[in-house]
C-alpha cells in the first residue's frame, strides 16, 4: 500500500534559528520516510531535508538550518512520502518568509507613570534580540489591574528602531497597580512571538476619589443632646491603593451656618453631639494632592416624621451568597443604605454598611460573614437628602446546633402536674434560629415522653403525671441544624396536694 499523500503542510520561520515544516499524517502504518524538497533564493537554489520514522519524536517534521536561510525570500516546499511500495508527493506549497516569521518576545524594561500626566503608564521595552533590524514590528500589549483576571489588549506598530520603544497607555484608573505583558511579530507575519515576562506598574496618585458617608442616630441624652455616630469610607470605585492623610468634618444647624463647627480626624468615624434641630454634615478626605469631593448628610430634627416605603423583606441563601431583597411602595426611591452587624448581647464590635443604587436587593459573599452568628440587617430608603424608616431582618449564613441547651427549672410541683420554665439561650450560644423546644421527661424506670413547643414559649405545664414519683427532665433547643439538650433536672410529684393538706390542717 502506498503511503498517504502528505497534506496540511505548515511551515514556520524561527528567525535566525531554523525553517521548520510539519505535515499530516503524523504516523504511518508501515515504515515510511520523507523528503522535504525546497527551492529557495527565489527559485535559484534547491535542497532536501530528509527524515524517517526511526527519527525520535514526531517524524512528520523537518527543519532547514542556517546558513542557507536568508531573509527575505520565497520558498516552495513539497513533501515526498516513501515506503516499500512507492512514493506519494504532496502538492507544492509556496512560502514567503516575511509572512511566516516568528521572533522571540520583547522584554518590558520599564512601566512607569509620567510625572504630572494622570491615569497613564509609559511602557518601554527592548526589541527582541532575534528580530530583523529593518522590519516594522506589530505589537499587542495586554494589561489588567492586579486583582483582575481579565486582560485588555491594545495593538500598535513600531517602525523606527533607533527611537525609544515606547507606548503610552492612557485612560487608566488613578493610583492602581497594573500588570503588563507584550508580544510582537513582523508586520507581515501571521505568527506572533510568545508573551513577554509580566511587569507591574502603578499609575500616579490623585486627590481622593470621594467618600460614602453614613450615620447611626442614638437616643437623646438627659441634657437633650443627641449622639450621632458618623462613619465614612472610600467611595465605591475609588482606587484600591488610595490612602487619605486625614478627614475634615464641618456641621451646622439648618439655616444657621454661623454656628458651623469643624473637626479634623484621621479616623473613619466620629461621634457628634447635636441639638434637636435639623443639621447638615459635610466630610472631605485629603491627601498630599488635594481634597475629595464633599460628602453630604442631613441629620433630621428629633421630632421629624420619617417616610416609610419598604413593605417586606426576605433574606435567602444561595450556594455562596446571602441575598436580601425588599419591596417598596415608592418607585421614586432608588438609593438604599444597608447596615449589618452581629446580633450579640454586648455592643457589636463590627458594624458594616453599604449603599445600593438602582436595585432592590443586596448581596454579600457568605465568607464575609461568620458562620453560626446571627446578623441584624437593616435597609434604609434614601430619597435625595432624606432617610426613611428602616426595615430590618435577621439572618445566619450557616446554622449549627446550639452550643448549650436551656437552663431549666421545675416550679409549682403538684401531685400530677409540674410547671417547667427555662431561660432563653444567650445569643452567643444559639448558633441559629431557635425554631422549637422539646421537653423530654421520664419517670424512674418508666417510658420517656416528649412535648415540642414553639420557640416563643419559655414555660410549659406538664399534666397527667404519676403521684409521688421521681422524674428526670431536660429541655432541648433546636435550630435547623439540630438540637442541644439543657441540663437534666429531677423532681418528685407530691403524694398529696398542698391544697388538701392545708384544708385538712384547718380542721
Amino acid at each position: 500500500v502506498l503511503p498517504a499523500k502528505p497534506e496540511n503542510i505548515s511551515c514556520i520561520f524561527y528567525y535566525e534559528e531554523n525553517f521548520t515544516c510539519t505535515w499530516s499524517p503524523e504516523k504511518e502504518a508501515s515504515y515510511t520516510w520523507y523528503k522535504v524538497k525546497r527551492t529557495y533564493s527565489y527559485g535559484y537554489k534547491s535542497d532536501i531535508c530528509s527524515t524517517d520514522n526511526s527519527t525520535r519524536g514526531n517524524h512528520a517534521s523537518c527543519s532547514f538550518l542556517p546558513p542557507t536561510i536568508t531573509n527575505p525570500d520565497n520558498y516552495t516546499i513539497q513533501v515526498e512520502a516513501q515506503n516499500a511500495d512507492g512514493i506519494m508527493k504532496s502538492d507544492i506549497t509556496y512560502w514567503n518568509l516575511d509572512a511566516i516569521m516568528k521572533i522571540e518576545p520583547p522584554e518590558i524594561f520599564s512601566v512607569k507613570s509620567v510625572l504630572g500626566i494622570k491615569r497613564m503608564l509609559q511602557i518601554k521595552w527592548i526589541r527582541p534580540v532575534l528580530a530583523p533590524h529593518s522590519s516594522t514590528l506589530k505589537y499587542t500589549l495586554r494589561f489588567r489591574t492586579i486583582n483582575s483576571a481579565y486582560w485588555m489588549e491594545v495593538n500598535f506598530t513600531k517602525e523606527d528602531i533607533d527611537r525609544d520603544e515606547t507606548y503610552n497607555l492612557t485612560e487608566l484608573q488613578a493610583f492602581t497597580e497594573y500588570v503588563m505583558t507584550l508580544r510582537c511579530a513582523p508586520a507581515e507575519s501571521m505568527f506572533w512571538s510568545g508573551w513577554s515576562q509580566e511587569k507591574v506598574g502603578t499609575t500616579e496618585e490623585e486627590a481622593p476619589y470621594g467618600l460614602d458617608l453614613w450615620r447611626v442616630l442614638k437616643p437623646a441624652m438627659v441634657d437633650g443632646r443627641r449622639p450621632v455616630q458618623l462613619m465614612w469610607k472610600k467611595a465605591t470605585g475609588a482606587p484600591v491603593l488610595e490612602k487619605a492623610l486625614g478627614y475634615n468634618i464641618w456641621y451646622f444647624p439648618e439655616n444657621n451656618t454661623n454656628l458651623t463647627e469643624t473637626v479634623n480626624t484621621t479616623n473613619q468615624t466620629h461621634e457628634l453631639y447635636l441639638g434637636g434641630k435639623t443639621y447638615w454634615v459635610y466630610v472631605v478626605s485629603y491627601n498630599s494632592l488635594g481634597e475629595s469631593p464633599v460628602a453630604t448628610l442631613r441629620i433630621p430634627a428629633l421630632n421629624e416624621k420619617t417616610f416609610q416605603c419598604i413593605e417586606a423583606m426576605q433574606a435567602c441563601l444561595t450556594q455562596d451568597q446571602l441575598v436580601v431583597e425588599w419591596q417598596s411602595s415608592a418607585p421614586e426611591v432608588d438609593t438604599w443604605m444597608v447596615e449589618w452587624f452581629p446580633d450579640v448581647d454586648s455592643e457589636p464590635s463590627s458594624f458594616s454598611w453599604e449603599s445600593v443604587s438602582q436595585a432592590r436587593n443586596w448581596t454579600i459573599q457568605k465568607d464575609e460573614l461568620k458562620p453560626l452568628w446571627c446578623y441584624n440587617i437593616s435597609v434604609y430608603p434614601v430619597l435625595r437628602d432624606r432617610v426613611g424608616q428602616p426595615y430590618s431582618t435577621q439572618a445566619y449564613v450557616q446554622e449549627g446546633i446550639p452550643s448549650a441547651g436551656p437552663v431549666t427549672q421545675a416550679d409549682s410541683i403538684g401531685v400530677k402536674t409540674v410547671t417547667i420554665t427555662w431561660k432563653e439561650i444567650p445569643k452567643s450560644k444559639r448558633n441559629g434560629f431557635i425554631k422549637n423546644y422539646t421537653i423530654f421527661y421520664q419517670a424512674e424506670d418508666g417510658k420517656e415522653f416528649s412535648k415540642t413547643v414553639n420557640s416563643n414559649i419559655l414555660q410549659y405545664r406538664l399534666e397527667s403525671l404519676t403521684r409521688r414519683t421521681s422524674y428526670s427532665l431536660q429541655v432541648m433547643a433546636s435550630t435547623n441544624a439540630g438540637g442541644t439538650n439543657g441540663t437534666k433536672i429531677n423532681f418528685k410529684t407530691l403524694s398529696i396536694s398542698h391544697h388538701h393538706h392545708h384544708h385538712h390542717h384547718h380542721h
Epitope: 527582541p128 533607533d162 507591574v200
Partner: antibody
Framework: EVQLVESGGGLVQPGRSLKLSCVAS????????MTWIRQAPGKGLEWVAS????????YYPDSVKGRFTISRDNAKSTLYLQMNSLRSEDTATYYC??????????????WGQGTLVTVSS | DIVMTQSPTSMSISVGDRVTMNCKAS??????VDWYQQKTGQSPKLLIY???NRYTGVPDRFTGSGSGTDFTFTISNMQAEDLAVYYC?????????FGGGTKLELK
C-alpha cells in the same frame, strides 16, 4: 564564549575625568543593550548607565546624570563610560554587563571582571 | 526607585546547613527578582532569575521563590564553595535596584 573585558580604571583627582572601555566578544554585540554597574569598596551593587543596542537611547540614575556618558562603537564591539567631574563617592569597581536582554535568563547574565576607579586627592 | 531590603545582612553557617535569606521590595515587582552570588575578589554571577529559574549550570541546591514584594533564596545543603555575598535584584522596572546583600560566613 561571551567575554567582557574592562579597562581604563585608576587613580584620579576629584573634579577630573576618566574614560572606561569594555571590549566584548563571543556574541553579536550590536544585538544587545549594555550596562555599567558599580560597587564601592565593601558595599553593594549600583546601576550606573545603560545603552540600547543601536546606541539611540541612554539611561542614567540621578547620581551620575549630567556627569557620566555611556556610548558604544558597534563596529569595534566596545562599550565606553566617560566620567567627568568625578567625586570621592564615585570610587568603586566598575563592571561592564550585557543586558538587560530579551534572551531567556536574568537581565545581567554576563559580567566583566571589573576595573577599579579611585577618586582621591 | 524601588528599594530592595535584604535580610539578614550576614549569617554564620556550617557546611550541610539549610540557608534561607529574604528580600523585600518597597512595591510590587511581580515575579521579577534575580539572585546573584559574589565571591571575594570576583564579579557577581547570576544564579536564579524571575524568581525561581535556575540559570545554566547552577546546582539544584540553589532555589528561589516569591512574588509581589516578598522573595526568598535558599541553599538546601550549604557547601564550602558557597561562601559568598548574595544579592537580590528587581528587574520589574528601570532602574534595576539591588538589595544590600547577605554575607555567608563559616561558624
Amino acid at each position: 564564549e561571551v567575554q567582557l573585558v574592562e579597562s581604563g580604571g585608576g587613580l584620579v583627582q576629584p573634579g577630573r575625568s576618566l574614560k572606561l572601555s569594555c571590549v566584548a566578544s563571543g556574541f553579536t554585540f550590536n544585538n544587545y543593550w549594555m550596562t555599567w554597574i558599580r560597587q564601592a569598596p565593601g558595599k553593594g551593587l549600583e546601576w550606573v548607565a545603560s545603552i540600547t543596542n543601536t546606541g539611540g537611547s541612554t539611561y542614567y540614575p540621578d547620581s551620575v546624570k549630567g556627569r557620566f556618558t555611556i556610548s558604544r562603537d558597534n563596529a569595534k564591539s566596545t562599550l565606553y563610560l566617560q566620567m567627568n567631574s568625578l567625586r570621592s563617592e564615585d570610587t568603586a569597581t566598575y563592571y561592564c554587563t550585557r543586558g538587560p536582554t530579551t534572551v531567556v535568563g536574568g537581565w545581567f547574565a554576563y559580567w566583566g571582571q571589573g576595573t577599579l576607579v579611585t577618586v582621591s586627592s | 526607585d524601588i528599594v530592595m531590603t535584604q535580610s539578614p545582612t550576614s549569617m554564620s553557617i556550617s557546611v550541610g546547613d539549610r540557608v534561607t535569606m529574604n528580600c523585600k521590595a518597597s512595591q510590587n515587582v511581580g515575579s521579577n527578582v534575580d539572585w546573584y552570588q559574589q565571591k571575594t575578589g570576583q564579579s557577581p554571577k547570576l544564579l536564579i532569575y524571575r524568581p525561581s529559574n535556575r540559570y545554566t549550570g547552577v546546582p539544584d541546591r540553589f532555589t528561589g521563590s516569591g512574588s509581589g514584594t516578598d522573595f526568598t533564596f535558599t541553599i538546601s545543603n550549604m557547601q564550602a564553595e558557597d561562601l559568598a555575598v548574595y544579592y537580590c535584584m528587581q528587574s520589574n522596572s528601570y532602574p534595576p535596584t539591588f538589595g544590600g546583600g547577605t554575607k555567608l560566613e563559616l561558624k
